[in-house]
């Protein structure tokens, strides 16, 4: 066990031309915070895709007002260290996502609205105990410069955290087999620990955090009966080819779970729901303080000072269970109403709502801009009881949510040709043709094929949009 | 960092094709881009000698450059290169490769590389 | 071929003085103000000052200004420094996607 510290050091424009517009502005105040996403190995996966490793997320940083005219600076930044908190061994290689959010604090209805700034992803390697490693990463026009670090917690250490230490019980030496634990040399390394929920009568290890099975039995934890398993396998093979006449025991037959446990089948096993006082995989660890660590996912527990007496998890958002070891999907429920994105942020539940929506449900129906429902700098642009949205440079879609190149769409009109520049996408025309997206011919004599020509719009006039 | 970087070798002798190589780096090809190569010769001005347009991968050459440039990409390894052809002593120059991201002006140049051209 | 013509070629003055570089273009840039303005010290590439004929890029100095537009261009040095001294070129973008760069300003401290 240990934890994964991420210290973020500044975040502003990058290096070289096009600053970025400032996120805030007088009339839309706003204050950043950041997220971070961990991932055992050197994952390719998707954004989306489930945090391992673990997540967190940072207080809100100050307050901060664009001044009219000044560039983007760097933005005061939120106190404190990012933690993520990792139960098992640190893996060594991880991947990670670093998520830059905006929160507007103008009159929004329904409270505050959260939007993407930037998104930063890597792949590192990385030994725990080890010193702060600096990065600088950076999206679009935006750098972020932050530290890492990993660290295990006592009684662990080593560059995995699985190797356990504990203090000698006789001032000489350590017990049978057992070395002293550098660079702690007053402690002595403590006996192997399996992977958690191995099951201790049917499983064993030779490594820290492995669970191999004795004969008959099998499952990642070693609490599948062989006999059973095939026939219990949705995508086993079929009874007659396995001699299984009869579907065997299910896993709940005989209920498993010890003191009081209820019992549910999961697709491969079963799943205990233990009473407070015990836990384990089948309920079966009881005497349990709150000395000995039992909530799990940050809960925090409370009472149980002695063994006889019970102890509480008060669970944090997105976990519960008796010792908070189960991941609620709150997402599952819902809960975001006329297509808005739930997003599961651990300390709260937001919804992302679509173009048109607003509220912390996106229960409201916005006809026109007051929602200010355009992400990622995108420009509200009202008409006819609806609205739509002109997007910032790299962002497309309906509410400027996507992640686009402005000129993946061939915006320029034939033959004109596109640059993405950072105030917008530019299109410069063939010769012949004129107008915003090269739409217009140029006729032999000069004027224009322009029903009417605004005002200034010249042959050849280039045009940029937001 | 966006950055670029000019290669290729010192000298050349006359009557060869030079060819040099643009590292960037920072930046990919998929947005839209127009990725140019200027030359100056010594104690002279700039001069432009063309360019590659990233988004259909179309070139423009000066007009004295047209039948002795060739410009081309290689987006694997993040490279654009620039071949002249039958190269004489008045090709000696500071070789800048460039980035043009609209409005017509080069924001990004490379540091430049000295070829000469003598037997 | 276009040309663009810069005058005067070489200029000498003095600190605090105000300079003035001109730009003719024998046709007409695109969009009327697709021209820019480098700066050039020995041994280093161009330095991007003004694009779209007026714009200042980011980080450099309010002193530098441009004006002009179609054939006509001017850039304007406020109050000259001893850090000015160097060559200034114009450059244009025309239709056609062609590009030209100016004969260059050599712009010397008294």
């Known amino acids: 066990a240990g934890v994964f510290e991420l210290q973020i050091h500044s975040f502003g424009p990058g290096p070289g031309p096009g600053a970025p517009r400032s996120p805030c502005s007088a009339r839309l105040p706003c204050r950043l915070f950041f997220r971070v996403c961990l991932k055992p190995g050197l994952s390719e996966e998707a954004a989306e895709s489930p945090c391992a490793l673990g997540a967190a997320l940072s207080a809100r940083g100050p307050v901060y007002t664009e001044q009219p005219g000044a560039p983007a600076p760097d933005l005061p930044l939120p106190d404190g260290l990012l933690q993520v908190p990792f139960r098992d061994a640190w893996p060594g290689t991880f991947s990670f996502i670093i998520e830059t959010w905006r929160e507007e604090l103008g009159d929004q209805i329904g409270g505050p609205a959260w939007s993407l700034l930037a998104r930063v992803a890597g792949r590192r390697r990385l030994a725990a105990g080890g010193p702060w490693a600096r990065d600088i990463q950076r999206a679009g026009a935006w750098e972020l410069r932050f530290s890492y670090r990993a660290r295990c917690e006592p009684p662990a250490v080593g560059t995995a955290c699985t190797r356990l230490c504990r203090p000698r019980s006789a001032p000489s030496r350590c017990g049978p087999g057992l070395r002293p634990c550098a660079p702690l040399e007053d402690e002595c390394e403590a006996p192997l620990v399996c992977r958690a929920g191995c099951s201790p009568e049917h499983g064993f290890c030779e490594q820290p955090g492995e669970c191999r099975c004795l004969e008959g039995w099998t499952g990642p934890l070693c609490t599948v009966p062989v006999s059973t398993s095939s026939c219990l396998s949705p995508r086993g093979p079929s009874s007659a080819t396995t001699g299984c006449l009869v579907p065997g025991p299910g896993p709940c037959d005989g209920n498993p779970c010890a003191n009081g446990g209820s019992c549910s089948e999961t697709p491969r096993s079963f799943e205990c729901t233990c009473p407070r006082g015990f836990y384990g995989l089948r309920c079966e660890v009881s005497g349990v303080t709150c000395a000995d660590g039992p909530c799990f996912n940050g809960g925090l527990c409370v009472g149980g000072a002695d063994p006889d007496s019970a102890y509480i998890c008060h669970c944090p958002p997105g976990f519960q269970g008796s010792n908070c070891e189960k991941r609620v999907d709150r997402c599952s429920l819902q809960p975001c109403r006329n297509g808005g994105l739930c997003l599961d942020l651990g300390h709260a539940l937001r919804c992302r709502c679509r173009a048109g929506f607003a509220g912390p449900r996106c229960e409201h129906d916005l006809d026109d801009c007051a929602g200010r429902a355009c992400a990622n700098g995108g420009t509200c642009v009202e008409g006819g009881g609806a609205h739509r949205c002109s997007c910032a440079l790299g962002f497309g879609g309906r509410d400027c949510r996507e992640r686009a190149d402005p000129c993946a769409a061939r915006p320029c009109a034939h033959g004109g040709r596109c640059y993405a520049h950072f105030s917008g996408l530019v299109c410069a025309c063939a010769p012949g043709y004129m107008g915003a997206r090269c739409e217009f011919p140029v006729h032999p004599d000069g004027a224009s094929a322009l029903p009417a020509a605004p005002p200034g719009l010249r042959p050849g006039d280039p045009q940029r949009y937001l | 960092q966006v950055t670029l970087r000019e290669s290729g070798p010192a000298l050349v002798k006359p009557t060869q094709t030079l060819t040099l190589t643009c590292t960037f780096s920072g930046f990919s090809l998929s947005s839209s881009y127009d990725m140019g190569w200027v030359r100056q010769a010594p104690g002279q001005g700039l001069e432009w000698m063309g360019t590659i347009y990233t988004g259909d991968y179309s070139t423009d050459y000066a007009s004295w450059a047209k039948g002795r440039v060739t410009i081309s990409v290689d987006t694997s390894k993040n490279q654009f290169s620039l071949k002249l052809s039958s190269v004489t002593a008045a090709d000696t120059a500071v070789y800048y490769c460039?980035?043009?991201?609209?409005?017509?002006?080069?924001?990004?140049w490379g540091q430049g590389t000295l070829v000469t051209v003598s037997s | 071929d276009i040309q663009l013509t810069q005058s005067p070629s070489f200029l000498s003055a003095s600190v605090g003085d105000r300079v003035t570089i001109t730009c003719q273009s024998t046709?007409?840039?695109?969009?009327?103000?697709?021209l820019s303005w480098y700066q050039q010290k020995p041994g280093q590439p161009p330095k991007l000052l003004i694009y779209q004929a007026s714009n200042l890029e980011i980080g450099v100095p309010s002193r530098f200004s441009g004006s002009g537009s179609g054939t006509d261009f001017t850039l304007t040095i406020n109050s000259l420094e001893a850090e000015d001294a160097a060559t200034y070129y114009c450059q244009g973008y025309y239709s056609g996607y062609s590009y030209a760069f100016g004969g260059g300003t050599k712009v010397e401290i008294k």
């Open positions: 460039a980035r043009h991201t609209g409005y017509g002006y080069f924001g990004l």
């Open positions: 046709e007409s840039v695109y969009g009327s103000d697709w």
